[in-house]
């Protein structure tokens, strides 16, 4: 028989983690495996049909994507949809596929809303999701004794699809669910100094443990301004929510692993400011299969898609599409073996959820509502050389924090700063005022 | 030949102005006219196919509506779509129909965004739209000498589809385009007293000419609180943006034409407070055809749809669907006469735009970008008996304000209050400080 996979991803723009130039080769590699393995869909042909989730400007679109999905459904009646990745594109498509009772598989769509499976029925996320970041941060808070207050800042940048809004939304909601904690969240515009200065006025009153989702340059600017305002000492800790590790990568901007460095006149100050900074990223898979997969992926991307794939965490997304597709095909194979059909979306989906799977990204666990458990890394500066390195990993499946041996978190005080200052944010603790008065007697 | 009209409107919930129980009878009456008139589509049959824009709870939905549109397109390949009316339902449908190059005709979708015809190509709005309210308000400001500052308040009520947000958005953007004026806008929650108190603190610093979109009860509450705070004297004017005249209707709530009256202990104060209030509504058509149409509409609604239609401005919406559909059929007839086809959406649409038409709602003008010119009424209190009555009408086609003979706007000072107080909002006018100092010498 024939199994049709309808792809709705950016076909022209290569800059998204889920661009077809990146995911296409991963799909090819997965389908090559299906062909090579007699236990997967024996006697079946799997073919892909493509629709674009971009508008004419190459930007993800909440109109183009569902229109593409409708056209594909109409013409090809696919068994499964692959993508979209962008939140605004995935939302209408996911609601359509739910209505059609056709499975949707993606390694994007990380926003909180997609976890609501009455609205997004049969949507499986084989990639990371922002609520899972909340699981990590909650575990971190428990470990470090921060159970009362946090502050989350997120940048608004025109044309970035509100990435940081959705990231902080997922993080905020899940942390609040997991811990009985006060969390404030504030938005700022990266290209307006007044937004930074207002944040700096607010910080002393609102938090000492601060999460920031922004571009690497904006994070550095904020750290420099915080240093200038005297907010970068031992009392504060700033977590950069840099999930794809952009600031650690080198290239045009920061030096590799030295996210404070730009080769400009502010490097000395920036290095000092970054002593109060830590960086949160997805975890890079460290299994040998992943490295082998990346070699093949890059080769295929260049050969068949004329695309040169850079290194970095962004490649975990095509790898997750690869693993997700294999998991889906495994589920279809089992459904057929039990007398079902490829159009039995509910049955197939149920076989994917609450299941573990060994993929190129390592051990992969899809939870009971169809979302992948996600691993994260926490990076900290080595005070000796200013380079950042992973000091702690979070295993999403076991929900455990695992220290990297021989490395520990670096705290200027020798211990984590309290999440609420000793005397309260506005010196409101009566005991402190009492002390203060007694010294005047 | 056959011409298929695909309807995407609320089929179950009768509370929307564009519910099928209201619009259906209007469509029936229009199609009866087509049958009866030999000059309209001779030899053609017009049929309607129905899709619902509501979700399972009977609420307009940005998922249900485009899904319905897709299903109708698929199964019936219609020549035109009628509806949706709700903003969130109409947005994806309008983008889909633009992509399909199929005309969309509605008397809803009043939000500013639908005026952008590169995105909503072939969308014709035969009903009122919020940007046109801005044309009226700009004309009013010119007439009354308010060319510097205004304040717009809009209520957020869960589940009301952000009606007031969209209304104030259209008003705000168009007034700013038409006049070189500073306009501030603030949102408030109708069910939170702290929001009202914050508004009352803000008003003295932000405006004297104040537009308020809210429920009648919330407007009355705000007026009572303003009176209590001393903000209701001759210095302020409060315009209730009550476009369907809900507060003037009687029934369960206010007495007819006495929007301040509730038969409670606050009526005396409310009447006093409402001396600073004016009400803006759509204009009730006063042509004899409209009254005759309403009689038939109500009869048909009861007979065929088992729905009892109340009186009120809300009936201008089904009437506008009626007129719009006849205008569309006129345009199709002309297109066919010129050798075109019913699928020639561009040509048909061009024949509807920039065109006048005598309908049951009176003289109807569609502007050059496919939006109907809209008439408004301004209501003011008769100080003698406390009843509100129309004192001024706005003709959207001629863009003129037309006073109702024998009636004039009622101003406590005898003239409109200035939009900026004599000494500025914060007494910042140096001349005033000078005066003030001189009295101390």
């Amino acid at each position: 028989g024939n199994l049709t996979v309808a792809v709705v991803l950016p076909l022209a723009n290569t800059s998204y983690p889920w661009s077809w130039a990146r995911v296409g080769p991963a799909v090819e590699l997965a389908l090559a495996q299906v062909k090579a393995r007699p236990d997967l869909l024996p006697g079946w042909t799997v073919r892909t049909v493509l629709g674009s989730s971009e508008n004419a400007l190459g930007v993800c679109s909440d109109t183009a994507a569902p229109l593409a999905a409708v056209d594909l459904k109409w013409e090809h009646n696919p068994a499964v949809f692959l993508g979209p990745g962008c939140v605004y594109a995935a939302a209408p498509v996911g609601r359509f596929t739910a209505h059609w009772r056709v499975p949707l598989l993606t390694a994007g769509a990380p926003a909180l809303g997609f976890g609501v499976k009455d609205e997004y029925a049969l949507t499986t996320r084989a990639g990371p999701s922002y609520a899972k970041l909340g699981d990590f941060v909650a575990a971190l808070h428990r470990r470090l004794g921060w159970e009362r207050q946090a502050l989350m800042l997120y940048a608004y940048r025109p044309g970035d699809e509100e990435h940081c809004f959705f990231l902080v939304e997922g993080l905020f909601m899940r942390v609040r669910d997991r811990l009985n904690i006060t969390v404030d969240h504030l938005e700022f515009a990266e290209d307006d100094l007044s937004h930074y200065t207002r944040l700096l006025r607010t910080m002393p009153r609102k938090g000492r443990v601060i999460y920031i989702c922004s571009s690497p340059d904006a994070f550095r600017t904020l750290m420099l301004l915080a240093l200038e305002a005297g907010l970068c000492g031992e009392d504060y800790v700033f977590f950069h929510l840099d999930i794809f590790g952009q600031s650690l990568q080198g290239g045009q901007g920061p030096a590799p692993r030295r996210p404070w460095e730009r080769g400009d006149g502010q490097d000395v100050s920036a290095r000092q400011a970054f002593q109060a900074a830590k960086i949160i990223t997805y975890k890079d898979p460290d299994n040998p299969e992943y490295l082998e997969f990346l070699k093949q992926l890059k080769h295929l991307a260049y050969e068949q898609f004329n695309f040169t794939m850079e290194d970095g965490l962004v490649n975990t997304i095509p790898a997750s599409f690869h693993d997700g597709l294999l998991l889906y095909i495994q589920a279809v194979t089992e459904t057929l073996a039990h007398g079902g059909t490829v159009t039995d979306g509910e049955n197939i989906t149920q076989r994917m959820w609450n299941r573990s799977f060994q993929g190129v990204t390592g051990y992969l666990k899809i939870d009971s509502s169809g979302d992948r458990e996600t691993d994260f890394s926490l990076w900290d500066m080595d005070p000796e050389n200013g380079a950042f390195r992973v000091v702690l990993n979070y295993n999403g499946t076991s929900q455990e924090l695992v220290a990297v041996s021989g490395r520990k978190l670096n705290w200027p005080l020798g211990y984590p700063p309290p999440d609420i200052p000793k005397c309260g944010f506005d010196n409101e603790d009566p005991a402190c005022n009492q002390d203060h008065l007694s010294t005047l007697e | 030949g056959n011409l298929t009209v695909a309807v995407v409107l609320p089929l179950a919930n009768t509370s929307y102005p564009w519910s099928w129980a209201r619009v259906g009878p209007a469509v029936e009456l229009a199609l009866a006219q087509v049958k009866a008139r030999p000059d309209l589509l001779p030899g053609w049959t017009v049929r309607t196919v129905l899709g619902s824009s509501e979700n399972a709870l009977g609420v307009c939905s940005d998922t249900a509506a485009p899904l319905a549109a897709v299903d109708l397109k698929w199964e019936h390949n219609p020549a035109v779509f009628l509806g949706p009316g709700c903003v969130y339902a109409a947005a994806p449908v309008g983008r889909f129909t633009a992509h399909w190059r199929v005309p969309l005709l509605t008397a809803g979708a009043p939000a500013l965004g639908f005026g952008v015809k590169d995105e909503y190509a072939l969308t014709t709005r035969a009903g009122p739209s919020y940007a046109k309210l801005g044309d009226f308000v700009a004309a009013l400001h010119r007439r009354l000498g308010w060319e510097r500052q205004a304040l717009m308040l809009y209520a957020y009520r869960p589940g009301d589809e952000e009606h007031c947000f969209f209304l104030v958005e259209g008003l705000f953007m168009r007034v700013r385009d038409r006049l070189n004026i500073t306009v501030d806008h603030l949102e408030f929650a109708e069910d939170d007293l702290s929001h009202y108190t914050r508004l009352l603190r803000t008003m003295p610093r932000k405006g004297r000419v104040i537009y308020i979109c809210s429920s009648p009860d919330a407007f009355r509450t705000l007026m009572l609180l303003a009176l209590e705070a001393g903000l209701c004297g001759e210095d302020y004017v409060f315009f209730h943006l009550d476009i369907f005249g809900q507060s003037l209707q009687g029934g369960q709530g206010p007495a007819p034409r006495r929007p301040w009256e509730r038969g409670d202990g606050q009526d005396v104060s409310a009447r006093q407070a409402f001396q600073a209030a004016k009400i803006i509504t759509y204009k009730d058509p006063d042509n004899p055809e409209y009254l005759e149409f309403l009689k038939q509409l109500k009869h048909l609604a009861y007979e065929q749809f088992n729905f009892t239609m109340e009186d009120g401005l809300v009936n201008t919406i089904p009437a506008s669907f009626h007129d719009g559909l006849l205008l569309y059929i006129q345009a199709v007839t002309e297109t066919l006469a010129h050798g075109g086809t019913v699928t020639d959406g561009e040509n048909i649409t061009q024949r509807m735009w920039n065109r006048s038409f005598q309908g049951v709602t009176g003289y109807l003008k569609i502007d050059s970008s496919g939006d109907r010119e809209t008439d408004f009424s301004l209501w003011d209190m008769d100080p003698e008996n406390g009843a509100f009555r129309v004192v001024l009408n706005y003709n959207g086609t001629s863009q003129e304000l037309v006073a109702v003979s024998g009636r004039k706007l009622n101003w406590p000072l005898g003239y409109p209050p200035p939009d900026i107080p004599k000494c500025g909002f914060d007494n910042e006018d140096p001349a005033c400080n000078q005066d003030h100092l001189s009295t101390l010498e």
């Epitope: 990266e190 290209d191 307006d192 100094l193 007044s194 930074y196 200065t197 207002r198 700096l200 340059d217 600017t221 420099l224 301004l225 200038e228 305002a229 005297g230 730009r262 080769g263 400009d264 006149g265 502010q266 | -």
Partner: antibody, heavy 119, light 107 residues
């Protein structure tokens, strides 16, 4: 709308003093840094002084260090430049500029006030 | 202090031409570079910040590029209103410094 209006310029003798003022509207000066930039007629632009958003950092160009003082009055939304020991070579048009250090740089400029130092 | 060197100091071009002005910093300034346009008797107007970002309201015929020490301003199709003096400026480190200017004249 952002506006910066300088005043206080004029003719002064060498060794004399002037106090330039800059009234800002459309934004709060305490949310931004502010700078003074001067331009000798027919010549290029020279930055001479800056103050950061919270007033905690003040910077001067070497060419005028010790002779100028920058200050700000947040309540009046105004910036000032006190200039002492003026020299003929200080004759220039002095612009008040909103300063977004590390973000957008010098984004809004006043039209300038002319200072003429002449005996 | 960081020196900014602009070239050329003057440039003649015709309406419709594409022109490029370069600016070099004496030490690395990453992308903290702005470009200004000044017309006689007027205050400078900010065109570009962060080396390549357009200030709001500036037409897209202006573009900037570069990072570190070498930067360029390009005007894709000259119009009569574009003939003016252009300055680059670094805002990485105080004291801020400007290039000496490039006067763009009609040929």
């Amino acid at each position: 709308e952002v506006q910066l209006v300088e005043s206080g310029g004029g003719v002064v003798r060498p060794g004399g003093s002037l106090r330039l003022s800059c009234a800002a509207s459309g934004f709060n000066v305490d949310d931004y840094g502010m700078s003074w930039v001067r331009q000798i007629p027919g010549k290029g632009l020279e930055w001479i002084s800056g103050i950061n958003w919270n007033g905690g950092r003040i910077y001067y160009a070497d060419s005028m260090k010790g002779r100028i003082t920058i200050s700000r009055d947040n309540a009046k939304n105004s910036l000032y430049l006190q200039m002492n020991s003026l020299r003929a070579e200080d004759t220039a048009l002095y612009h008040c500029v909103r300063d977004q250090w590390l973000v957008r740089g010098l984004d809004y400029w006043g039209q300038g006030t002319l200072v003429t130092v002449s005996s | 202090d960081i020196q900014m060197t602009q070239s050329p100091s003057s440039l003649s071009a015709s309406v419709g031409d594409r022109v490029t002005i370069t600016c070099r910093a004496s030490q690395g300034i990453y992308n903290y570079l702005a470009w200004f346009q000044q017309k006689p008797g007027k205050a400078p107007k900010s065109l570009i910040y962060a080396a390549s970002s357009l200030q709001s309201g500036v037409p897209s015929k202006f573009s900037g590029s570069g990072s570190g020490t070498d930067f360029t301003l390009t005007i894709s199709s000259l119009q009569p209103e574009d003939f003016a003096t252009y300055y680059c400026q670094q805002y990485n480190t105080y004291p801020y410094t400007f290039g000496q200017g490039t006067k763009l004249e009609i040929k």
